[in-house]
């Protein structure tokens, strides 16, 4: 994906394996009123020290308080996957929009590919 | 909702050449518009963008050979700063499908011009 | 940049048959993809975009599939107004930057 990877840390000149978020559904049409859900995953291998929660984006824009957002970790002995769902019940022609999920690694910062939403009246 | 190109004619190889679209019930405020070419008896050739918010891209091998701009709320040029008998087409405009203020977007094509014919010859 | 490559070039079928192109992307690109249809003349037309969805006021003739680097466009029961060329493309996009490209074209021939 087209996303900006860590290729070292701040720490140490060792190399990182690149991370980015896996290949989403990328274009979503529906209709006024329906309910959709949809997600950003993540998997961060234990090599990395320091990671910050997952936001969500629309058009530009981080979306804040009264947005039903829920993140799921799942840790392994390579290190934690991360999964961030976003849903949105009854979806207005004003939830139109491109989402992208951003995340820092390492003090640099991973954006998604988009998630575009089209509610069709 | 419409949009006409203008513009094309017949010019020598290096004359610069501006194109306008004119587009009618389109905010351009609010959709991105493109321009895409056709040589004769070729396919679609995708050359650049502008978007609601004045960012411009361009195809790649595009880059330094056009320059698109909002000349107006109602204006788009295409300008082909040093054509070639390589640049002789159909140009035309044509509104992305995505209604936004933002730079970038999924820019589908939903309504396009007739087209203009551009020739460049000796 | 995406390379959208699309095969055949060229299709021949009988009016009431069925044909199908193929496009492929260079690299995933999700469902950002559109079909187009163009006869001579005139400028294309949207027939389906995000890979599967009709846009208005096209028939359920045709019919769009595939996802990440693998697209197909089917029409059935061909009639002899779809005689026309086809055209695949890529409107994937990033935070940062847009990559949008069509695909060489399939000339439909109906006979």
């Known amino acids: 994906a087209h996303t900006a990877a860590p290729q070292v840390t701040s720490t140490a000149s060792k190399l990182l394996p690149p991370v980015a978020f896996n290949h989403t559904i990328g274009h979503i049409v529906l209709s006024e009123h329906k309910n959709v859900k949809f997600n950003c995953s993540i998997n961060i291998p234990n090599t990395y020290q320091e990671t910050a929660g997952i936001s969500w984006w629309k058009d530009g824009k981080e979306l804040l308080g009264a947005h039903h957002s829920i993140t799921q970790f799942y840790p392994d002995e390579e290190g934690v996957s991360i999964i961030a769902l976003f849903s949105i019940a009854s979806v207005q022609r004003s939830d139109n929009g491109s989402y992208f999920c951003k995340m820092k690694v390492n003090n640099r910062e991973i954006v998604s590919d988009p998630i575009y939403v089209e509610v069709q009246g | 909702q419409s949009l006409e190109e203008s513009g094309g004619r017949l010019v020598t190889p290096g004359t610069p050449l501006t194109l306008t679209c004119t587009v009618s019930g389109i905010d351009l405020s609010s959709y991105a518009l493109g321009w895409v070419r056709q040589a004769p008896g070729k396919g679609l050739e995708y050359i650049g963008i502008i978007s609601s918010t004045g960012t411009t891209y361009y195809a790649t091998w595009a880059k330094g050979r056009f320059t698109i701009s909002k000349t107006s709320s109602t204006t788009v040029d295409l300008k082909i700063t040093g054509p070639t008998t390589e640049d002789t087409a159909t140009y035309f405009c044509?509104?992305?499908?995505?209604?936004?203020?933002?730079?970038?977007?999924?820019?589908?094509?939903?309504?396009w011009g007739p087209g203009t014919l551009v020739t460049i010859s000796l | 940049d995406i390379v959208m490559t699309q095969t055949p070039a060229s299709v021949e079928a009988a009016v009431g048959g069925t044909v199908t192109i193929k496009c492929q992307a260079s690299?995933?690109?999700?469902?950002?993809l559109a079909w187009y249809q163009q006869k001579p003349g005139q400028p294309p037309k949207v027939l389906i975009y995000?890979?599967?969805h009709l846009a208005s006021g096209v028939p359920s003739r045709f019919k769009g599939s595939g996802s990440g680097t693998q697209f197909t466009l089917t029409i059935s029961d061909l009639e002899c107004a779809d005689a026309a060329t086809y055209y695949c493309?890529?409107?994937?996009?990033?935070?940062?930057?847009?990559?949008?490209?069509f695909g060489g074209g399939t000339e439909v021939v109906v006979r």
């Open positions: 690299q995933s690109i999700s469902n950002f």
């Open positions: 044509a509104r992305g499908a995505y209604a936004g203020y933002v730079a970038f977007g999924p820019y589908y094509f939903h309504i």
């Open positions: 995000a890979a599967s």
């Open positions: 493309q890529s409107y994937f996009y990033s935070s940062t930057s847009i990559y949008n490209a």
